[in-house]
Interface confidence: medium
């Protein structure tokens, strides 16, 4: 996480800054949503617990050709200690439950806001 580069300035950024920037990007996505996000693509729902950043990335990385979430995918990769590729499946996914990307983003945003408020930046 300490290696996560800021998008406004190069070099390492503190975990609180990285989380804040991720939240701001998710807010930006929900604000600018004119048509169905990613054409209504469905992704695996995840348990919002420890390890959720990797799980979130594993879900979203399977959505291709959706420029609206590319920045989010890059940001999430900075929070995940291992390399994630399409087709990976984590135990944190809620099996047999798929939701629209728009709902996934809203749920993730809600949870990240809670973490930020509580000072849980890692």
């Amino acid at each position: 996480l300490t290696c996560l580069g800021g998008f406004a300035s190069p070099g390492p950024v503190p975990p609180s800054t990285a989380l804040r920037e991720l939240i701001e990007e998710l807010v930006n996505i929900t604000q600018n949503q004119k048509a169905p996000l990613c054409n209504g693509s469905m992704v695996w729902s995840i348990n919002l617990t420890a390890g959720m950043y990797c799980a979130a990335l594993e879900s979203l990385i399977n959505v291709s050709g959706c420029s609206a979430i590319e920045k989010t995918q890059r940001m999430l990769s900075g929070f995940c200690p291992h390399k994630v590729s399409a087709g990976q499946f984590s135990s944190l996914h809620v099996r047999d439950t798929k939701i629209e990307v728009a709902q996934f983003v809203k749920d993730l945003l809600l949870h990240l806001k809670k973490l930020f408020r509580e000072g849980q930046f890692n």
Epitope: F7, T17, R20, E21, I23, E24, V27, F116
Partner: antibody, heavy 121, light 107 residues
Framework: EVQLVESGGGLVKPGGSLRLSCAAS????????MNWVRQAPGKGLEWVSY????????YYGDSVKGRFTISRDNAKNSLYLQMNSLRAEDTAVYYC??????????????WGQGTMVTVSS | DIQMTQSPSSLSASVGDRVTITCRAS??????LGWYQQKPGKAPKRLIY???SLQSGVPSRFSGSGSGTEFTLTISSLQPEDFATYYC?????????FGPGTKVDIK
């Protein structure tokens, strides 16, 4: 002491321009998103604009979109509002207000004292 | 845009009274709501954030509750310095919107 101090208000003719400034002190300005809020005489509060901590995200209220521009200089701990094509209905006290993270957390915890903008011929 | 309505628009009360102000959002905003107090000629002051969390330094007679679309600010025992106008603010989505305000004056 955490403080926000606005300046730049004054009397301007309709169609004119004005640039407001907000000087921040007592906290790490670059870690906070910032907003402008205004209040017309005898009226309620109206949110005007938002800028994220790292300049990446900017939003405006419909009534000022295309006329006002929000900006910031983190090196100078300053927030700005460039107001063009001013109208009589823009007459108000303008406040800058601190924000944790846009549209999410504990918005508007610290406010400046306000600067008065009067648009009149 | 999310519309915020506040009731009542004004109220007269006496020192020691329990005062309740309600704010409604036109759509769900979770707990992204703050309550502000404003006195004439002064900047607003935050009392409550995240719908129910008390701002540091604010007396405990102020409390907030609610989630989703309906929120309440309660002053358990009104004090002379509490006579002011109170606003709610939703900061769930842009444009941020304030309620029209509730003026609390002396009966």
């Amino acid at each position: 002491e955490v403080q926000l101090v606005e300046s730049g208000g004054g009397l301007v003719k309709p169609g004119g321009s004005l640039r407001l400034s907000c000087a921040a002190s007592g906290f790490t300005f670059s870690s906070y998103s910032m907003n402008w809020v205004r209040q017309a005489p005898g009226k309620g509060l109206e949110w005007v604009s938002y800028i994220s901590s790292s300049y990446n995200y900017i939003y405006y209220g419909d009534s000022v979109k295309g006329r006002f521009t929000i900006s910031r200089d983190n090196a100078k701990n300053s927030l700005y509002l460039q107001m063009n094509s001013l109208r009589a209905e823009d007459t108000a006290v303008y406040y800058c207000a601190r924000d944790q993270v846009g549209a999410t957390l504990d918005a508007f915890d610290i406010w400046g004292q306000g600067t008065m903008v009067t648009v009149s011929s | 845009d999310i519309q915020m309505t506040q009731s009542p628009s004004s109220l007269s009360a006496s020192v020691g009274d329990r005062v309740t102000i309600t704010c409604r959002a036109s759509q769900g905003i979770g707990d992204d709501l703050g309550w502000y107090q404003q006195k004439p000629g002064k900047a607003p002051k935050r009392l409550i954030y995240a719908a129910s969390s008390l701002q540091s330094g604010v007396p405990s007679r102020f409390s907030g509750s609610g989630s989703g679309t309906e929120f309440t600010l309660t002053i358990s025992s009104l004090q002379p310095e509490d006579f002011a106008t109170y606003y709610c603010l939703q900061h769930n989505s842009y444009p941020f919107t304030f309620g029209p305000g509730t003026k609390v004056d002396i009966k």
